[in-house]
């Protein structure tokens, strides 16, 4: 048919470029290349339908479904989901292509379905149909990466059984400490599974696909540097894979090492050795300790011993069960305004834990960092001074943790009025929750100092806003004070602020704010 | 990648008012606080103030109280420091930070000449 | 205001030794079991780079040579081995409290 325009589908994915999680805004978007979604002329269908293909999509991704229409004239259009109409604005490209988009902001369950856009054009209608559905991610996964011995050479194969098929990559550092640090120059990444240069420092394996990433780091003892002031323990799991490598550095090859556990040396097949000479002509030696699926009683103290260096120990700890170790009983702060804080949790976990710290329904990203006791600690100070709730919340494969601090921020009153026909309310923020005088202003008591005590009712933190306690206290209306001008008072630690009523008729009148400090 | 971009430099006569911007990438500013450091040629820095720019709530040293206006756009998420009634005492660069845990990322500084 | 006083005003060390440099506050920089002393970094020309935080986190990419350490009012910055690149003016600052405060800077050199 000549008559049929020539149109294209395509759908644009949108990276939200936002550093904080759980935001509804749309701001700052970058897109994605478009996709081509094809838009065939679907066969046996009454009236002009053409139909894209299927459109799959992540929970809270964010999509542009665009048709392109290369037609004379003016278009108009229709949007139908589920029943129900909506505006459709098309506009024209510098290809003179009418464009009609409709974007789906933060992906939901309700909002996958059948879209159609209904095109009138001068010469012809037609339907085009968008199918649109959440990817069912309930069969992805994404397991930590362990470490297996490659068969009959000197080598680890990175191991991460995960759907969709990860990209493994391993993470190799030669310097010491935080510089070690993802970003950092001294890391060095390699995108494979089988790794043979294995002297470096620090040494982690990465698993990544659309679920994240997952890193297991090689555990080390290296007989050059000084042990730590506890002993580094390691936690496995029943039935996983035990690695642990020796490092010793010396100005010959006159040196041996060995592992034992519990002063009994490692059976053969538990452990195997390689060396090399470095740059400046010392010896590398190491020794992997290696046991391919624990069991309850390989648990105890793994001791690398060397002819020439002081011997060091970790401790082994084989678990039933992950978990999260940590207090979670709820704590409380009281800070002002112009001070620091930050508020802390730490905790003792295997697996590493994911976490997140939370706030007024939005979440923020949550750092860890690993103490030398063997304890984590995650630290969050950017509140902004925010009162209210904040919940940290951590878990892994066997174990979750909740725990909620309460941050108070100490500061004057502020007051706001509201009347009607038979009472006065006046209510304040601050901290300490303040309390409050109601005071009549009359000839008698020009300054307002006469106190009104009957008909005051007083409610604390009747209300949460934002996270913020209001106090707030309502005057009934008396004969006697029916027509003056009365002033509601809220006072705290930091200061006064008062607000002043006219009592006359029905409705709001704050008349004047007094601010006392 | 997280970065403040700070616009260019100013030369500005005594007397006069200046406005300077610092844009955020890679992260939302609503969801941080925006300071500005103070530093005259060859000497320490200073702490200017900052924002939030959530709900445009400021603080400042008592010492550029008056001197020193900070606003925020969160629809361009952008910073801006405005400084008045210059003298040769406000010839200095300006920087804009993000604080979010400690003062880990600073815009490259914008550098204000007041000269007649 | 907390005042910090840094110390030296300038210092010059050998490569491959150790340069220390001292930052003392007027009063406690502690909150709530947080040290608030920051370390920063400024080369001629560019802006002050966090090294350290909260006393001795380093900041991301910083090299495990530069590490910080003290307490309550006394704080340090040590850098080993010394390196050529660390060629630089070192300033200490607190963010306990606002207004937030900067010692008046160390002038690291090479000897």
């Known amino acids: 048919n000549q008559d049929l325009p020539v149109i294209k589908c395509v759908l644009i994915n949108h990276k939200n470029n936002d550093s904080s999680v759980g935001k509804s805004s749309s701001y700052p978007m970058v897109s994605e290349s478009p996709e081509d979604l094809g838009c065939a002329l679907r066969p046996q269908s009454s009236g002009t339908v053409y139909e894209a293909a299927a459109v799959e999509v992540d929970v809270s991704a964010s999509i542009t479904l665009q048709v392109l229409v290369d037609a004379p004239g003016n278009i108009s259009c229709l949007w139908v989901f589920k029943h129900s109409s909506l505006n459709c604005q098309p506009h024209f490209d510098l290809q003179n292509r009418g464009v009609v988009s409709m974007v789906i902001l933060k992906m939901t369950e309700t909002q996958a379905g059948e879209y159609l856009l209904f095109i009138q054009s001068e010469a012809t209608n037609y339907t085009i149909l968008f199918t649109v559905s959440i990817r069912n991610t309930l069969l992805y996964t994404l397991r930590r990466p362990y470490f297996r011995k490659m068969e009959n050479q000197d080598a680890l194969v990175c191991i991460s059984e995960s759907v969709p098929e990860p990209i493994v990559e391993w993470v190799l550092c030669d310097s010491q400490g935080e510089s070690c640090k993802e970003e950092s120059p001294a890391v060095v990444k390699k995108e494979e599974k089988v790794l043979h240069e294995l002297f470096g420092t620090d040494i982690r394996c990465c698993a990544r696909n659309e679920l994240g990433r997952e890193c297991t780091r090689l555990f080390t003892i290296d007989l050059n540097q000084t042990p730590q002031t506890t002993l580094p323990q390691l936690f496995l799991k029943v039935g996983e894979p035990l690695w642990i490598r020796c490092k010793a550095v010396h100005v010959n090859h006159g040196f041996g090492l060995t592992w034992e556990l519990e002063n009994k040396a490692l059976e053969e097949g538990n452990y195997f050795e390689m060396s090399t000479y470095s740059t400046n002509r010392t010896m590398i030696r190491i020794l992997f300790a290696f046991v391919s699926s624990v069991a309850r009683n390989d648990t105890g103290y793994y001791t690398c011993s060397s002819s020439k260096h002081p011997s060091q120990s970790a401790l082994v700890t084989i678990v039933e069960k992950g978990f999260i170790n940590a207090t979670n009983s709820s704590e409380d702060y009281e800070i002002d305004q112009y001070e620091e804080f930050c508020f802390s949790v730490r905790f003792k976990a295997y697996p590493q834990i994911r976490c997140t710290w939370t706030f007024s329904r939005k979440s923020f990203p949550c750092e860890q960092k690993g103490l030398d006791n063997g304890y984590s600690i995650s630290k969050f100070c950017n509140h902004k001074h925010q009162p209210g709730e904040y919940i940290f919340h951590a878990e892994n494969d066997d174990a979750q943790f909740t725990k909620m601090f309460t941050l108070n921020i100490r500061r004057k009153p502020q007051v706001l009025a509201e009347a009607s026909a038979s009472q006065a309310s006046c209510f304040s923020d601050g901290y300490p929750l303040p309390s409050w005088t109601w005071k009549k202003c009359s000839d008698k008591s020009p300054n307002c100092t006469e106190e009104i005590t009957e008909g005051v009712w007083n409610r604390k933190a009747n209300r949460k806003v934002f996270g913020q306690w209001v106090s707030s206290s309502t005057l009934n209306m008396s004969e006697a004070i029916k027509g003056f001008l009365v002033k509601c008072c809220a006072y705290n630690s930091l200061g006064t602020s008062c607000e002043t009523i006219l009592l006359n008729s029905p409705g709001p009148f704050p008349f004047i704010q007094d601010n006392i400090s | 990648e997280v970065q403040l971009q700070q616009s260019g430099a100013e030369l500005v006569r005594p007397g006069a008012l200046v406005k300077l911007s610092c844009k955020g990438s890679?992260?939302?500013?609503?969801?941080?606080?925006i300071h500005w450091v103070k530093q005259r040629p060859e000497q320490g820095l200073e702490w200017i103030g900052r924002?939030?720019?959530?709900?445009?709530?400021?603080m400042y040293d008592p010492k550029f109280q008056g001197k020193a206006s900070i606003t925020a756009d969160t629809s361009s998420n952008t910073a801006y420091l405005q400084l008045s009634s210059l003298t040769s005492e406000d010839t200095a660069v300006y920087y804009c930070a993000r604080n979010g845990n400690f003062f880990a990322y600073w815009g490259q500084g914008t550098l204000v000449t007041v000269s007649a | 205001d907390i005042v910090l006083t840094q110390s030296p005003a300038s210092l010059a060390v050998s490569l491959g030794q150790r340069a220390t440099i001292s930052c003392r506050a007027s009063e406690s920089v502690d909150n709530y079991g947080i040290s608030f002393m920051n370390w920063f970094q400024q080369k001629p020309g560019q802006s002050p780079k966090l090294l350290i935080y909260a006393v001795s986190n380093q900041g991301s990419g910083v090299p495990a040579r530069f590490s910080g350490s003290g307490s309550g009012t006394d704080f340090s910055l040590n850098i080993h081995p010394m390196e050529e690149d660390d060629t630089a003016m070192y300033f200490c600052q607190q963010s306990k409290e606002v207004p937030w405060t900067f010692g008046g800077g160390t002038k690291l050199e090479i000897k």
């Open positions: 924002i939030d720019p959530e709900n445009d709530i400021t």
């Open positions: 890679g992260f939302n500013i609503k969801d941080y606080y």
